[in-house]
């Protein structure tokens, strides 16, 4: 399945929107830095495209879920959030089309299921951190920075998959 060129542009727009969402000076937030343990190995180049797309889909779905909460709506600019949702929704659609195309071709590898679980656990850690920090502005900024980094890393994987073909 070939992801459309617009998918890459959408990924870049998503990162731009995340950058624009920033609301406070970040230097005072250093003490809230946290190791969320992004499962980078699950986005390694050893995977085939068919195995990677469901993992990328899970990643974007979890980002969507994280920023769709009541607490998130209170933390960020509504207009930017709406644009952000639109971009994520479009990327989910692109990836879902690929997942559907891949159904029935091969059995779902166990490796892929483990990777999806690792992504879910990563987002559980982020959610728990926000809860522990009482959804403070700094905690949200730390999470935004983390999502920018992890989303960027997963986007880079998409690009490397495309260039390999």
């Amino acid at each position: 399945c070939d992801l459309p060129q617009t998918h890459s542009l959408g990924s870049r727009r998503t990162l731009m929107l995340l950058a624009q969402m920033r609301r406070i000076s970040l230097f005072s937030c250093l003490k809230d830095r946290h190791d969320f343990g992004f499962p980078q190995e699950e986005f390694g180049n050893q995977f085939q495209k068919a195995e990677t797309i469901p993992v990328l889909h899970e990643m974007i779905q979890q980002i969507f879920n994280l920023f769709s909460t009541k607490d998130s709506s209170a933390a960020w600019d509504e207009t930017l959030l709406d644009k952000f949702y639109t971009e994520l929704y479009q990327q989910l659609n692109d990836l879902e089309a690929c997942v559907i195309q891949g159904v029935g071709v091969t059995e779902t590898p166990l490796m892929k299921e483990d990777s999806i679980l690792a992504v879910r656990k990563y987002f559980q850690r982020i959610t728990l951190y926000l809860k522990e920090k009482k959804y403070s502005p700094c905690a949200w900024e730390v999470v935004r920075a983390e999502i920018m980094r992890s989303f960027s890393l997963s986007t880079n994987l998409q690009e490397s998959l495309r260039s390999k073909e």
């Epitope: 970040l26 937030c29 830095r33 980094r149």
Partner: antibody, heavy 121, light 108 residues
Framework: EVQLVQSGAEVKKPGESLKISCKGS????????IGWVRQMPGKGLEWMGI????????AYSPSFQGQVTISADKSISTAYLQWSSLKASDTAMYYC??????????????WGQGTLVTVSS | DIQMTQSPSSLSASVGDRVTITCRAS???????LNWYQQKPGKAPKLLIY???SLQSGVPSRFSGSGSGTDFTLTISSLQPEDFATYYC?????????FGQGTKVEIK
């Protein structure tokens, strides 16, 4: 390959102005902060301040607040450190280094080669 | 501001020795964001350890970091000729970021 390349050595007179630069390459310049560190001859490292090139937000050490200005031009991936009126006590080696911001990643993992500033009448 | 105090200020050691440098913060670094750097004369500092105990990529495993709260340690398990340098700790917990005064490791 990640690189921070600083401008060359400067010899200035007291009261003169100066702007030194630090050009980043091999990474997304706006995804990292740039910090500036002073090292006076035979002395230790002193943190001067930091800039987020994505929006030019800055933070300074109280010791350097009002003494220097940190700026950045993200269009050319360059950070700057400037003085409006140099003093003999500004004679030092100045380093820039990249910082991961709020990410849990190595602090100051790449450094520029340093710019030696000599202020003498 | 968080003050960082290193000890000793200098030490003499031989190749193969185990070397320990300590760094004490004036207040607790609650997320343990304490970094260690090595600097050789005429060169820029080089990151060795970040977040108290994480070894920076490409740094030999003879270097290790430990500690939490206010007390941190850099250990060189078996000193090599290229390890003679000045070592600095730095807290990344809050601005202003601050460095220790340095520990010079010299040849005995």
């Amino acid at each position: 390959e990640v690189q921070l390349v600083q401008s060359g050595a400067e010899v200035k007179k007291p009261g003169e102005s100066l702007k030194i630069s630090c050009k980043g390459s091999g990474y997304s310049f706006t995804s990292y902060w740039i910090g500036w560190v002073r090292q006076m001859p035979g002395k230790g490292l002193e943190w001067m301040g930091i800039i987020d090139p994505s929006d030019s937000d800055t933070a300074y050490s109280p010791s350097f607040q009002g003494q220097v200005t940190i700026s950045a031009d993200k269009s050319i991936s360059t950070a700057y450190l400037q003085w409006s009126s140099l003093k003999a006590s500004d004679t030092a080696m100045y380093y820039c280094a990249r910082h991961p911001g709020l990410n849990w990643a190595p602090d100051f993992d790449y450094w520029g080669q340093g710019t030696l500033v000599t202020v003498s009448s | 501001d968080i003050q960082m105090t290193q000890s000793p200020s200098s030490l003499s050691a031989s190749v193969g020795d185990r070397v320990t440098i300590t760094c004490r913060a004036s207040q607790s670094i609650r997320n343990n964001y304490l970094n260690w750097y090595q600097q050789k004369p005429g060169k820029a500092p080089k990151l060795l350890i970040y977040a108290a105990s994480s070894l920076q990529s490409g740094v030999p495993s003879r270097f290790s970091g430990s500690g939490s709260g206010t007390d941190f340690t850099l250990t060189i398990s078996s000193l090599q000729p290229e390890d003679f340098a000045t070592y600095y700790c730095q807290q990344g917990y809050d601005t202003p970021l601050t460095f220790g005064q340095g520990t010079k490791v010299e040849i005995k």
